[in-house]
Interface confidence: low
């Protein structure tokens, strides 16, 4: 299972995003995309 900080947030958010991760369905910027250095 995905265990990074990114993924933990993703599981809580539950929605797919274009970045490959998931985001909350609102207009507030959130740190929950596919982590890129």
């Amino acid at each position: 299972a995905c265990d990074t900080a990114t993924c933990v947030t993703h599981r809580l958010a539950g929605l797919l995003s274009r970045s490959g991760g998931v985001v909350k369905n609102n207009f507030v910027p959130t740190n929950v995309g596919s982590k890129a250095f």
Epitope: P29, A36, F37
Partner: antibody, heavy 122, light 107 residues
Framework: EVQLVESGGGLVQPGGSLRLSCAAS????????ISWVRQAPGKGLEWVAE??????????HYAEAVKGRFTISRDNAKNSLYLQMNSLRAEDTAVYYC?????????????WGQGTLVTVSS | EIVLTQSPATLSLSPGERATLSCKAS??????VSWYQQKPGQAPRLLIY???NRYLGIPARFSGSGSGTDFTLTISSLEPEDFAVYYC?????????FGQGTKLEIK
Amino acid sequence: EVQLVESGGGLVQPGGSLRLSCAASGFTFSNYWISWVRQAPGKGLEWVAEIRSESDASATHYAEAVKGRFTISRDNAKNSLYLQMNSLRAEDTAVYYCNCYFDYGLAIQNYWGQGTLVTVSS
Amino acid sequence: EIVLTQSPATLSLSPGERATLSCKASKRVTTYVSWYQQKPGQAPRLLIYGASNRYLGIPARFSGSGSGTDFTLTISSLEPEDFAVYYCSQSYNYPYTFGQGTKLEIK
């Protein structure tokens, strides 16, 4: 204009300590996840440590190679990131980059500093 | 830790040609893969994130594809400034890891 400026690198003896700094400007620093990534001379990239944003409780994660020796921290009031490096070894010799990352959901921001060289040698 | 293996180690091509770089993960990483370009004496530059999304300002000739364990960076028509070292990375599991790099050189 976005800027990330690392400092604090230099020559240190094995077993010694250094504190690297990364000064940020031009963006809302507290919103960003930040990593230190290093690159040994002539080698590839290696992730060192990560600190999450203020809203994510500034949680930290470390590579096994530095766990217990390095500490990542941030001062959002000063727009600064730090890496306290103790018990330094020859294999820690590298250029150290700070990298800031923020996700808007449909887009991301990703900034790199120019790097600071750490040389561990007797 | 998840190991990323890039191939080939060196790719010799001419401007105008198509470049295909591979990155294989030792375990499934869904789409948590990014690609970076690095030139001598410079910091890495993000090209692709989420396996297939071009970063801001990256030319359309760069594209990424793949999911699971196999990923590809394609440069459709090489420009002189594209000759550099390319790294893939994964952020599916800690520790975040990078591939060893592919050097794209002028033939």
